[in-house]
């Protein structure tokens, strides 16, 4: 669902997301600190263009654990 | 209070274009996206693409895609939606509606309607 | 595209009447399902959200019910002025769609 060219909007990004994070938690609008561009939010990065699990990641409330 | 405030009805020839304006307010503008939805005489309602009025990025339906452009001025509040090329079935009432949250939980403010009528 | 079927409609009903309106998507839209209520020359109204959740300022009487594929909209007591079409409205991916309408009537 979020291969290349493709977009996610709505519901669908949420529970993407949701399954993505986990129980890390997400933002919408990822943290200044965190962005190594002009961050736009979610919505403009997945729904209004196409967006990658990588960068779906980039929105987890916290790194995941390396085991 | 929180409103939306649209440009009065249209008599457009086909071919012609329209712009229709909702100015917001009651509320932080830039902070929700905003809907543009249409509703031909008697029929059911039809999503035709949204705005993000903070950075004016778009995302439309495909059925519009070349035909329709939605743009904002956050000096007063306001979201346009032009539509070109119009035809007779381009007839309708079209509305602005405001983005609950995220695109995923509906629209819970509205314009009062714009009727635009093509014809000849 | 998902597309959203409603029934039946219209819908005949009498003052006091417990009305119950259904909307089906054609694929699975988990509880991303809206209810909206129009009156003629009237824009539409916000009723319910997230398939359940009944938004601000609307009576109680209205309420919401269903996951997946098929939803729910129920008046427990019709009162006059509900008497309008209701739209379901999916809001799990774009293009949002909205069901055909359900247009409830005075018997």
């Known amino acids: 669902a979020y291969g290349p060219g493709e977009t996610l909007c709505g519901g669908e990004l949420v529970d993407t997301l949701q399954f993505v994070c986990s129980d890390r938690g997400f933002y919408f609008s990822r943290p200044s600190s965190r962005a190594n561009r002009r961050s736009r939010g979610i919505v403009e990065e997945c729904c209004f263009r196409s967006c990658d699990l990588a960068l779906l990641e980039t929105y987890c409330a916290t790194p995941a654990k390396s085991e | 209070q929180v409103q939306l405030v649209q440009s009065g009805a249209e008599v457009k020839k086909p071919g012609a274009s329209v712009k229709v304006s909702c100015k917001a307010s009651g509320y932080t503008f830039t902070s929700y996206y905003m809907h543009w939805v249409r509703q031909a005489p008697g029929q059911g309602l039809e999503w035709m693409g949204i705005i993000n009025p903070s950075g004016g990025s778009t995302s439309y339906a495909q059925k519009f895609q070349g035909r329709v452009t939605m743009t904002r001025d956050t000096s007063t509040s306001t979201v346009y939606m032009e539509l070109s090329r119009l035809r007779s079935d381009d007839t309708a009432v079209y509305y602005c509606?405001?983005?609950?949250?995220?695109?995923?939980?509906?629209?819970?403010?509205w314009g009062q309607g714009t009727t635009v009528t093509v014809s000849s | 595209d998902i597309q959203m079927t409603q029934s039946p409609s219209p819908l005949s009903a009498s003052v006091g009447d417990r009305v119950t309106i259904t909307c089906r998507a054609s694929?699975?839209?988990?509880?991303?399902l809206n209810w909206y209520q129009q009156k003629p020359g009237k824009a539409p109204k916000l009723l319910i959200y997230?398939?359940?959740s009944l938004q601000s300022g609307v009576p109680s009487r209205f309420s919401g019910s269903g996951s997946g594929t098929d939803f729910t909209l129920t008046i427990s007591s019709l009162q006059p002025e509900d008497f309008a079409t209701y739209y379901c409205q999916q809001s799990y991916s774009t293009p949002l769609t909205f069901g055909g309408g359900t247009k409830v009537e005075i018997k």
């Open positions: 694929q699975s839209i988990s509880s991303y």
């Open positions: 509606a405001r983005d609950v949250q995220w695109l995923a939980y509906g629209m819970d403010v």
């Open positions: 997230a398939a359940s």
